[in-house]
């Protein structure tokens, strides 16, 4: 329906009347419409709604609406549909982010690493090494490092010290025994730490999503764990959450985590972050068997103060 009311419009535009050559000042049409007929000395301009597939965002004096952008290319999805007032807006679906004009999967932080910063549709996930007292036993693009179960807090003993990749394993406390096998001494930043965990060489592997390099690689798979990494079994009593499982094992062709390496993924010194990371204190169960994800090398540790 052509609109001629101008009460709510304050903007004007100049138009040259082709028949008289006179320069006229006409009222603009509102957003979502266009000027189907310019004003004359004796009549107001006429506004018409934008046809399907076109739009105008602002009040205007144009003779045709703008064409909407092309349909979203897969795997993008529409954030905003093409409508009279808005152009079509495409975004990457959940679990992906826009990189170099396309969508790339969020980095998957490997075992021993956790999410330092959540990914968005425009930014990749940033990973961080699990710090002392925390662990991550599954590759994930959404999970943070979690604090080791506090066995002592449940009046249980530590049957097996946790590492950056495994939780503590708690066992029934023998009341007759005053010793708590490798009981986690102190925790550095929040849950029972694995104080006597093994310092497993975690090779220099870093999930790309953790790199601070400003590369905008859009590869769909990242975070590879070197297949030649061997874990040491030398206990590093100094680091409570630094190691991996104490059993020696050579990582078999480590599964490749799909993840985008972005300049993001910093988990460094998370203020002494690694352990400082998750806030979600995990509820511990009386007896917890370590979850075993793919044997992943235990990468590096960072000041991780982030919590869940």
């Amino acid at each position: 329906q052509p609109e001629q009311k101008t009460l709510s419009l304050t903007g004007t535009y100049r138009h040259v009347d082709r028949t008289t050559g006179q320069v006229l000042t006409c009222d603009k049409c509102p957003a979502g419409t266009y000027v189907s007929e310019h004003c004359t000395n004796t009549s107001l301009r006429v506004c018409s709604s934008c046809p399907s597939g076109t739009f105008t965002r602002h009040e205007n004096g144009i003779e045709r609406c703008h064409d909407c952008s092309q349909p979203c290319p897969r795997p993008m999805i529409e954030r905003l549909p093409c409508a009279a007032l808005t152009d079509r807006e495409c975004i990457c679906p959940p679990g992906m982010y826009q990189s170099n004009g396309t969508c790339a999967p969020h980095t998957v932080c490997p075992v021993g690493w956790g999410v330092r910063k959540k990914g968005t549709e425009n930014e990749d996930v940033r990973c961080k090494q699990c710090a002392r007292g925390t662990f991550s036993d599954v590759p994930s693009s959404v999970m943070k490092c979690r604090a080791h179960t506090d066995c002592l807090g449940q009046n249980l003993m530590v049957v097996k010290q946790g590492t950056k990749e495994t939780d503590n394993v708690c066992g029934v406390h023998l009341s007759s025994s005053s010793t708590t096998p490798s009981s986690p001494g102190i925790a550095t930043f929040s849950h029972p730490e694995h104080t006597e965990s093994h310092d497993v060489p975690s090779s220099t592997y870093e999930p790309q999503g953790m790199n601070s390099t400003d590369s905008n690689s859009t590869a769909s798979v990242r975070t590879k764990v070197p297949s030649d990494i061997q874990e040491e079994t030398v206990p590093d009593n100094t680091s409570s959450t630094s190691g991996k499982e104490s059993t020696n094992r050579t990582l078999p062709n480590p599964p490749q985590l799909t993840h985008q390496q972005g300049p993001h993924h910093r988990h460094i010194l998370k203020l002494l972050p690694s352990s400082m990371e998750a806030t979600g204190e995990k509820s511990s169960t009386a007896i917890k068997a370590p979850k075993r994800g793919h044997p992943r090398q235990n990468p590096h540790k960072h000041f991780d103060i982030n919590e869940h």
Partner: antibody, heavy 115, light 110 residues
Framework: EVQLLESGGGLVQPGGSLRLSCAAS????????MSWVRQAPGKGLEWVSS????????LYADSVKGRFTISRDNSKNTLYLQMNSLRAEDTAVYYC????????WGQGTLVTVSS | QSELTQPPSASGTPGQWVTISCSGS????????VYWYQQLPGTAPKLLIY???QRPSGVPDRFSGSKSGTSASLAISGLRSEDEADYYC???????????FGGGTKVTVL
Amino acid sequence: EVQLLESGGGLVQPGGSLRLSCAASGFTFSNYEMSWVRQAPGKGLEWVSSIYSSGGETLYADSVKGRFTISRDNSKNTLYLQMNSLRAEDTAVYYCARDGAADYWGQGTLVTVSS
Amino acid sequence: QSELTQPPSASGTPGQWVTISCSGSTSNIGNNYVYWYQQLPGTAPKLLIYTNNQRPSGVPDRFSGSKSGTSASLAISGLRSEDEADYYCATWDDSLYAPVFGGGTKVTVL
């Protein structure tokens, strides 16, 4: 026994440069994130910079960004902090710390920036 | 000024219980683990508590940490003269994307 030993501190004029080193021993250096934390005379602790175990990622406090560079040589078990364009406010004892939890600290090295 | 707020000082007599608070926000303490460090006069800081409430081996059980919401606290029971030191809380700050320390609390044993 985990040991971290800083060196390289000293007196330097404003605008000058210094390179701090932190020699690590007693643990597998290449497995850990390392950080620098400083403490101005009579003041509290201030995080300065961190670096991943492989050196692939670094992080800096806004106050030193663009002036300081953290690096590491895993073959030498050594952490470095290159400090350029030093200012009077950079005067402090600089500590290197291990892991995201900063579970071990060196004894510190004093950097004095004064004319 | 620090993102984490600690009282500048705290004191107690031997045997007493002293608590130090550390107040932050959702972007730091509220969503991350808290760490506590002890710095004895003239020495380097030492990790005292990690992941909110865990003690590294060698740290007496007189020291305990806790966290609730956007605040954390360090409790020292059975205060001893050797506990006289500066205590710092620390955590990660999601907004700053950096670690942050509290201003420190000087504990004096009267």
